[in-house]
């Protein structure tokens, strides 16, 4: 008789694949731009690159430090009227894409929560949960949490509002905090919470350390849903050099969680190349004309367009990343197991009941290193077999598809491996 | 009308560093990239670097990385360039220049107009 | 780096003449998307900051006189004094704005 399939998890649709930050509408959409009509023409953009959620903002009148100028429920004229964006919501939808507002309020000022009136903020915050609801986002976003007093509180009073409105809305936290502890603590009173954090930021150095902050992580967490990101806001060069790109694309797309990303993340978007740009919020390279300030700057293969045309760019790998992220078992729900696999790696196994299986290899080090799978590490329900096919590689050529021995993987400097293998009784 | 106005000239030894001022007036200083340009003695005229004062991001010359830094005051309307590590060939007159016309904080077009009086700054032991 | 050349170093020439100094770029500094040139001249005199006469390659700069003029593209542009005058005598440097770092030529002085 033939096993009984384990029963599947609920899941939400921000279990089922990437969010995608856009913070700032006019740095997204290049300069002249930056509204909601504009931003509507770029969904299909956002479709290709199969995320589930559009984060945005904030986009709220805002004067600078100034809480009685501040309007939660009024769209910055800049960006657009409520008008536009009931239209840019209806879009959205229509190609599956959820839309979450970010209402950190003084979002142009020095404190994002203001220094003063904490309980007139709240208040805002509150009123403006309930007007956007009704208005049809499916989520909300509050960055900068640490400066907000009794941050845990106020948290656990919106998630009610937003799950009491439909168990289908999110809310999410952004902080600037890397201390587990504090994450913890925030974490603690609300259950359903989406938190970013810089947790991982300075997981840069080493497969060991990586493997020992994400393990850590998800002891700490225990059943909770994850989600995973560098930072609450900024790109991921802020914190990688180029070569490791690819290598945390892998990682954040095959980790248990929801991987979020900022927009530019895909196409390994860097400030420091762009003289001037701010480095939280730098034009968005759609072509070559995207920066015609210093236009040698600028060269096809940091563009979206020139990336699109080369199968072997990051934008490939990030597009084929979110697209097996969101219909795989094992990525979707899968239990995860991390083993030991050398010095300089990080190894992972992701797995669902019956359903195809994933093994991923991550060299950390700026040296090739023979792997050595440490499968004893494993418990029986997730045994490695002799040989796994590739999947993909982080580097150009090798040959896809092909079966690899486990025992002799060797793995080029930088480079991440995800590999796939059937269920065995 | 638009003004620079430079710190006065200085006097250091090798190894020390200077750190000169450019006080802005008559536009919207966060609007405009600053620029520095310097010019030994007899010679052409070398670009080191700028800021975008409206977030403080810098770009440095190659020549220039890891011994300058510039920084910027939005509440007194100055920045600053700041070389450290100063040897003898780094006699010259240093200029702060804006940028020639901007779109936006973030979007600037770089010739160079107006240009500060210039501080000479002289190295010698 | 895009290096910038001047010609010729220096120029004598007599009041109320025509005079041309040419300006070269290791690569091309037009830019295909709006069709302009990343070029800028300058004037300095001794003692003085440079003052911008020229920008976009022929663009005159507001209160510059329009006996000065620019032209050119691609690699190759011309500052043109179409009648030198007494104050005119200064050194001229044109300057690429396309990539970083930016970079001037040398230089070019003209004398009466």
């Known amino acids: 008789r033939a096993p009984r399939c384990r029963e599947l998890p609920a899941q939400k649709w921000w279990h089922t694949g990437a969010l995608y930050r856009i913070g700032d509408l006019q740095a997204f959409q290049g300069h002249g731009a930056g509204n909601l009509a504009g931003l509507k023409g770029r969904l299909d953009y956002l479709s290709s690159l199969k995320v589930k959620g559009l984060v945005l903002g904030p986009i709220h009148k805002n004067q600078k430090d100034d809480v009685a100028q501040t309007d939660l429920l009024q769209i910055d004229p800049n960006f657009g009227s409520k008008e536009d964006f009931d239209s840019l919501l209806q879009s959205a939808k229509k190609k599956s894409i959820r839309v979450i507002l970010d209402l950190t309020p003084n979002y142009r000022g020095e404190n994002s929560w203001f220094s003063t009136q904490v309980d007139t903020v709240a208040t805002k915050v509150k009123d403006a949960l309930e007007f956007w609801l009704q208005a049809g986002v499916d989520g909300f976003q509050v960055r900068d949490i640490e400066n907000l007093k009794d941050a845990s509180s106020f948290l656990a009073e919106w998630q009610n509002i937003t799950k009491g409105f439909s168990e289908d809305r999110l809310l999410i936290a952004g902080t600037n905090s890397s201390d587990l502890q504090q994450i913890l603590s925030l974490l603690e009173s609300n259950k359903d919470l989406l938190l970013t954090s810089s947790y991982l930021s300075d997981s840069g150095s080493t497969g060991e350390h990586t493997k020992s902050l994400v393990t850590q992580y998800l002891n700490a967490t225990g059943n909770r849903w994850c989600s995973w990101s560098l930072s609450q806001a900024r790109l991921l060069t802020s914190f990688l050099p180029a070569q490791l790109l690819r290598l945390y694309q892998l990682m954040l797309f095959t980790l248990p969680g929801t991987p979020v990303f900022s927009y530019g993340d895909e196409i390994g978007l860097d400030a420091a190349a762009l003289p001037g740009q701010p480095m939280e919020a730098p034009v968005m390279l759609w072509d070559e004309s995207s920066f015609p300030d210093i236009p040698g700057a600028v060269s096809a293969n940091m563009t979206v367009k020139g990336q699109s045309e080369d199968p072997g760019s990051l934008l490939s790998l990030f597009r084929r990343l979110s697209d097996q992220r969101s219909k795989e078992r094992s990525l979707l729900h899968g239990d995860f197991h991390a083993f030991s696999a050398g010095p300089g790696l990080f190894s992972y196994i992701r797995h669902w009941d019956q359903n195809e299986r994933f093994l991923v290899v991550l060299n950390f080090g700026d040296v090739g290193l023979s792997a050595g799978l440490q499968a004893s590490d494993l418990p029986a329900s997730a045994s490695l077999p002799a040989k796994a096919d590739l999947l993909l590689s982080t580097q150009p050529g090798r040959e896809e598809g092909s079966p690899l021995e486990l025992e002799r993987l060797k793995l080029e400097p930088h480079e991440g491996l995800l590999l796939r293998f059937p269920y065995a009784a | 009308q638009v003004q620079l106005v430079q710190s006065g000239a200085e006097v250091k030894k090798p190894g020390a560093s200077v750190k000169v001022s450019c006080k802005a007036s008559g536009y919207t200083f966060t609007s405009y990239y600053m620029h520095w340009v310097r010019q030994a003695p007899g010679q052409g005229l070398e670009w080191m670097g700028l800021i975008n004062p409206s977030g403080g991001s810098t770009s440095y010359a190659q020549k220039f990385q890891g011994r300058v830094t510039m920084t910027r005051d939005t509440s007194t309307s100055t920045v600053y360039m700041e070389l450290s590590s100063l040897r003898s060939e780094d006699t010259a007159v240093y200029y702060c220049?804006?940028?020639?016309?901007?779109?936006?904080?973030?979007?600037?077009?770089?010739?160079?107009?107006?240009w500060g009086q210039g501080t000479l700054v002289t190295v010698s032991s | 780096d895009i290096v910038m050349t001047q010609s010729p170093d220096s120029l004598a020439v007599s009041l109320g003449e025509r005079a041309t100094i040419n300006c070269k770029s290791s690569q091309s500094v037009l830019y295909n998307s709006n069709n302009k040139n990343y070029l800028a001249w300058y004037q300095q005199k001794p003692g003085q900051p440079p003052k911008l006469l020229i920008y976009?390659?022929?663009t005159r700069e507001s209160g510059v006189p329009d006996r000065f003029s620019g032209s050119g593209s691609g690699t190759d542009f011309t500052l043109t004094f179409s009648s030198l005058q007494a104050e005119d005598v200064a050194v001229y440097y044109c300057q690429q704005y396309y990539s970083t770092p930016f970079t001037f030529g040398p230089g070019t002085k003209v004398d009466i």
């Open positions: 220049a804006r940028a020639g016309y901007c779109r936006s904080t973030t979007s600037c077009f770089n010739w160079f107009d107006p």
């Open positions: 976009w390659a022929s």
